[in-house]
């Protein structure tokens, strides 16, 4: 079906939606992916929660946004921003970013277009 896109709504409403959801499970899920299940990640007690469980909780949280698809970019950017200072080196930043980019598909959403994940002003 052909469609012509109108306005997507305003980004401030996305920021409000992103603020309302708990992105911790997404952050934990990605950190587990890049650190490996067997390693302990200091910032969270993740030993008791399997990565697949975290992924499901993450997807559930993202689904809580009124317009998940439109606000996906802001959510991913917020996750990146939240974890930026915990990423120890350039390689870890790139790994985190790669996993973050795969997150929408893991949750059965479309990857956001035009989404710049380099949001930390060079910190990350």
């Amino acid at each position: 079906m052909r469609r012509e896109r109108g306005r997507q709504g305003d980004s401030s409403s996305c920021e409000r939606q992103v603020d309302r959801v708990n992105l911790k499970p997404c952050e934990q899920h990605i950190m587990q992916r890049i650190m490996g299940e067997q390693e302990q990640y200091d910032s969270y007690d993740i030993r008791s929660t399997r990565s697949s469980d975290q992924q499901q909780r993450c997807c559930d949280e993202l689904n809580e946004m009124e317009n998940t698809q439109r606000c996906m970019c802001e959510a991913l950017q917020q996750i990146m921003e939240n974890q930026c200072d915990r990423l120890q080196d350039r390689q870890m930043v790139q790994q985190f970013k790669r996993e973050l980019m795969n997150l929408p598909q893991q949750c059965n959403f479309r990857a956001p277009q035009r989404c710049d994940l380099d949001v930390s002003g060079g910190r990350c």
Epitope: S11, R114, D116
Partner: antibody
Amino acid sequence: EVQLVESGGGLVQPGGSLRLSCAASGFKFSTFYMTWIRQAPGKGLEWVANIKQDGSEKDYLDSVRGRFTISRDNAKSSLYLQMNSLRAEDTAVYYCTRNGLQDSYSGDFFDHWGQGTLVTVSS
Amino acid sequence: QSVLTQPPSVSAAPGQKVTISCSGTGSNIGHNYVSWYQQLPGTAPKLLIYDNTKRPSGIPDRFSGSKSGTSATLGITGLQTGDEADYYCATWDADLSAVLFGGGTKLTVL
């Protein structure tokens, strides 16, 4: 070598119509977003419209939405801009551009431009 | 009035460095990628930088791009007289569902 050649510009009265065409060659047309960009005499660049690879999504500048229609024919490697209800402020050189936007995590960028075709709306 | 703000003009001597700023908001530069274009007098624009920092093949490394928050910057080092042109930034605006161009900056090499 990538080439974009626009045609169809000219002088038209306010309220009139024109159809711009862009013949593309030197690349696989069906795999790229395409974009029309215009430049009024002595002014800056202004984006007009985007069309997705398969034509399923189109975006327009607010001031042309409902008056202009972007379309493409991938079999002919051609891009079109149907312009209706033309106004004096639509007077500009219209550029056909190839847009490097991919499906995710990339931005719009215009890596190849035609030479432009001048549209003059005047009575 | 463009939503992306650029200085109308900048100037510097040959061999010097110049930067051109492009200021926007969270709904455009803040969330999306920036590209830069050079338009020599009487010609079509040419892509200089895309996805904030990347250079297309054939663009010398004298040209660089960066982005921080809601602003982007084009840097040109080793200025040459042939760099005299108009320079434009561009990005997508999620609120408008449209590509925005800056108003353009005229570079004069003194």
